[in-house]
């Protein structure tokens, strides 16, 4: 008879995670006797995956009755694929013999590649928040996926993004992968209702890329604008000071009346309101008793926005010379300084 | 249903010849190692000779030229020509199949007894 | 030749008794052995191969185990049907070669 020959059909089987991947083997001869071994990788180091003699092998499956002595085909069946198994695999034909079995024959080897898909991917933004014109970070990562092949894209609201940096790792081969993506974004005054995407796209997601995504909210902060006024009052002894905090976020804010350098009243914004843009409006007011001053009153509105030093916008009312002389017997009207507020944010 | 069936056995006298038959069915013969094995009488098992699918023989010492090993494949029987036999022959001979990979032997047949003496 | 020599050559027990039997080979024989059941006048049926693979419809009660050169036939509750003659065998090269047998006979 001619010598035995180990026939494995296919040089590559891709299987999806979880699936189960068959390996075929066929001989064309039942001489010698002796066991059918099947073997990840070469060498001294290969991991053995089904001994025909011994050993329990609970993921593997034959495909044929190997206890029937007139069959040829060796081919078996591993269950439940991971990204671990990936690699090529040998069937092996032994000769029966002491101390060991001898090896006889290998086949050529199967290489068995394992399509896993990426997890879900998980957008981060930076550790704290910036403000419009500045850029921020933000990063994106995924894990393992196999084969290595994998396209990422970054979109702002829809629009592509192009300053950004990817990473396969690992470069080599491996059983699986991951990929680390960072995104440079300049952030604009209207970016709070902003989102950043991390798409993904991969052989395993048959043209349906997955998304993470991270919201702008997160990451801005939109200091707010001041502005000091006066309202019309009919008490003559009674002057309304306005202080408009506007186009801020996020909510946090805490504003501090002061008189001539003294602080007259602290509150802390509650009932906001919101623009289109995400951003909030609040307005703080302070009635002033012009018949306690004779003299002329600076004062100041002074706002911490979202734990940042405080801005502040000052505003100088006119005690009038006739109430100074009167004192604060004088309930004529208080002669007010011009509209236009004192300068000064600090 | 796999069977062997041996045939053949018989007295003889010593230095006489004896052809033993082992029939096989629910299996083809000629795919497997096949043997046989021998019992005298109060004593243990012997393996005396065996035929692989590849036509190879193999004998034990004692039986060394004077025993043939053979299988016709046609009536899928397997036989065992004895030749210049002794009384250290006499015993029952089974026909035994040899395992799938590893010929181990898995199914034995109920045996034919063969008395060398005179 | 590879020798097998089998231990003990006699043995009584009693039924729902877990006895064990030894074979010791000659040579390193791989796990190339194999026990058989002999009862008086029958032929001997197969039970063991690989050194511990049952064959086909043998109670799991009859268990091997052992690799090189010792080995071990273990029945682990004995009832009446199993008074009989054990062998052990070597079969990785001819000439195949059987231990001398073990009676396993009721006390």
């Known amino acids: 008879e001619d010598e035995l020959q180990v026939i494995q059909p296919e040089k590559s089987v891709s299987v999806a995670a979880g699936e189960s991947a068959t390996l075929r083997c066929a001989m064309t001869s039942l001489i010698p006797v002796g066991p059918i071994m099947w073997f990840r990788g070469a060498g001294a180091g290969r991991e053995l995956i089904y001994n025909q003699k011994e050993g329990h092998f609970p993921r593997v499956t034959t495909v044929s009755e190997l206890t029937k002595r007139n069959n040829l085909d060796f081919s078996i069946s591993i269950s439940n694929i991971t990204p671990a198994d990936a690699g090529t695999y040998y069937c092996v034909k032994f000769r029966k013999g002491s101390p060991d079995d001898v090896e006889f024959k290998s086949g050529a080897g199967t290489e068995l590649s394992v399509r896993a898909k990426p997890s879900a991917p998980v957008v981060s933004g930076p550790a704290v928040r910036a403000t419009p014109e500045h850029t921020v970070s933000f990063t994106c990562e995924s894990h393992g996926f196999s084969p290595r092949d994998i396209t990422l894209k970054w979109f702002k609201n829809g629009n592509e993004l192009s300053d950004f940096q990817t990473n396969v790792d690992p470069a080599g081969d491996s059983v699986s992968y991951s990929i680390h993506s960072t995104a440079r974004v300049v952030l604009t005054r209207g970016d709070v209702h902003s989102q950043v995407i991390c798409e993904i796209a991969h052989i395993t997601l048959q043209g349906d890329p997955l998304r993470g995504t991270a919201n702008l909210s997160e990451a801005i902060r939109v200091p707010p604008t001041l502005e000091v006024t006066q309202q019309p009052m009919r008490a003559e002894n009674q002057a309304n000071v306005t202080c408009q905090v506007s186009n801020f976020y996020p909510r946090g804010l805490q504003l501090t009346w002061l008189e001539n350098g003294n602080v007259s009243r602290t509150e802390t914004a509650s009932t906001l309101i919101e623009n289109k843009d995400g951003t909030y409006n609040w307005m703080s007011w302070l009635l002033v008793n012009t018949c306690a001053h004779r003299d002329d009153v600076v004062l100041t509105c002074q706002v911490e926005h979202d734990g940042q030093q405080a801005v502040s916008k000052s505003y100088a009312l006119e005690i009038s010379a006739h109430q100074k002389e009167h004192g604060s017997d004088i309930t004529h009207e208080a002669a007010l300084a011009p509209t236009a507020p004192l300068g000064g944010s600090g | 249903e796999v069977q062997l069936v041996e045939s053949g056995g018989g007295l003889v006298q010593p230095g006489g010849s004896l052809r033993l038959s082992c029939a096989a069915s629910g299996f083809t013969l000629s795919s497997y190692d096949m043997h046989w094995v021998r019992q005298a009488p109060g004593k243990g098992l012997e393996w005396v000779s065996a035929?692989?699918?590849?036509?190879?023989?193999y004998y034990t010492g004692s039986v060394k030229g004077r025993f043939t090993i053979s299988r016709e494949n046609a009536k899928n029987s397997l036989y065992l020509q004895m030749n210049s036999l002794r009384a250290e022959d006499t015993a029952v001979y089974y026909c035994v199949r040899g395992g799938v990979w590893d010929d181990a032997f898995d199914i034995w047949g109920q045996g034919t007894m063969v008395t060398v003496s005179s | 030749d590879i020798q097998m020599t089998q231990s003990p050559s006699s043995l009584s027990a009693s039924v729902g008794d877990r006895v064990t039997i030894t074979c010791r080979a000659s040579q390193d024989i791989n796990n190339y052995l194999a026990w058989f059941q002999q009862k008086p006048g029958k032929a001997p049926k197969s039970l063991i191969y690989?050194?511990?693979s049952l064959h086909s419809g043998v109670p799991s009660k009859f268990s091997g185990s052992g690799s090189g050169t010792d080995f071990t036939l273990t029945i682990s509750s004995l009832q009446p049907e199993d008074f009989a003659t054990y062998y052990c065998q070597q079969y990785v090269s001819y000439p195949y070669t059987f231990g001398q047998g073990t009676k396993l006979e009721i006390k």
């Open positions: 035929i692989g699918t590849a036509g190879d023989t």
């Open positions: 690989t050194a511990s």
